[in-house]
Amino acid sequence: GIAIPRNSGCPNSEDKNFPRTVMVNLNIHNRNTSTNPKRSSDYYNRSTSPWNLHRNEDPERYPSVIWEAKCRHLGCVKADGNVDYHMNSVPIQQEILVLRREPRHCPNSFRLEKILVSVGCTCVTPIVHHVA
Amino acid sequence: GIAIPRNSGCPNSEDKNFPRTVMVNLNIHNRNTSTNPKRSSDYYNRSTSPWNLHRNEDPERYPSVIWEAKCRHLGCVKADGNVDYHMNSVPIQQEILVLRREPRHCPNSFRLEKILVSVGCTCVTPIVHHVA
């Protein structure tokens, strides 16, 4: 069962089991009321581990369009603009929830899906394996 | 009208308007079939812009637990372990979709919500504003 005290104004549900089918209002509420001034969209160019953004579109998914990061270099960019291959540019990945149309092409029926997306890149010290 | 060639096996929907309420199966399908060996969980320590992970829990949200990154330093860590304040550690943020119980405490009724989460940190060259 679900661990939440029931609100008497809740919609009825035929299936009380978990996993279960729920009603979701797709009118997205935006918690980020104001544009965050510290949220820069040019980090991908200014980072020592810069990345490019690749467009991934799937009409059977909600959201249909996801922009994915791909690190530009294996190494990290130094102050002089050259790449330091003693360091590694690596993607920072996150598992996010998306909705997948199920059955396919159905406008009002979805299944939750977990996908792994690369959000940006960071510069890390490599793990060095010493051979005995 | 709704923008998808209708599959005859789709559930009925009373409201065809946009925005609309849809059915979602919460039995999560995981697209990431195998654990990605390159998806390292120690980047937060090995990065030149290391971060700590903070647990954010909200029982009215699905998923109820989200881990948020907070950069450890204003500057970036150099090879000698000291912090270089001529560079900046900045959070890489992403807007993600979550489900918010609506009305509150209802187990089977949600609304999509967009929230901004910090996934990790990257080291960037600062923007220098020159005063004339």
Partner: antibody, heavy 121, light 106 residues
Amino acid sequence: EVQLVQSGAEVKKPGSSVKVSCKASGYTFTDYEIHWVRQAPGQGLEWIGVNDPESGGTFYNQKFDGRATLTADKSTSTAYMELSSLRSEDTAVYYCTRYYRYESFYGMDYWGQGTTVTVSS
Amino acid sequence: EIVLTQSPDFQSVTPKEKVTITCSASSSISYIYWFQQKPDQSPKRWIYATFELASGVPSRFSGSGSGTDYTLTINSLEAEDAATYYCHQRSSYPWTFGQGTKLEIK
């Protein structure tokens, strides 16, 4: 009311650059990508590329890659298209149009009024 | 690049007549989109995702097709339908448009 209002007509010399703006209002700017399409006099429509104001991502029709630069300013809900190394064949009406990121089935639903760019020596 | 070929290029039609515009794709695509454009105006989204009429589009219009062959049909042409119609695909980059079909009222 959703509106995409573009900057005024431009006359440019060959080899120079032009920057067209597209100010959006009446919706959440970052929920939609901005696509750019052009139409040469008496001709059909040609897709230039896309900018995602949310992530800063861009993707171009290869024909324009390297010459077109698409940007957006979230603080003013304005998208920009800059085209460099102009030649006479770039004389066209340039349109911005929005595209819903969450449900792409809706396609390009609202268009700007168009900006005429004339390239002439 | 996927080439969209519309037929006919031009059609002069009498009011109340049925009109069919076809759009043939050089490779299979998922959906087709149709835009209407009148002289000195921006294109208007007319039919989206092959079948769906955009808001305000009269019900005399319909869209159909799959794979490589798509159709826009006007059941009973009216004077206000005089315009150029473009088909559009976004299944493959670069996104492309048909050359347009100009409808004229006799």
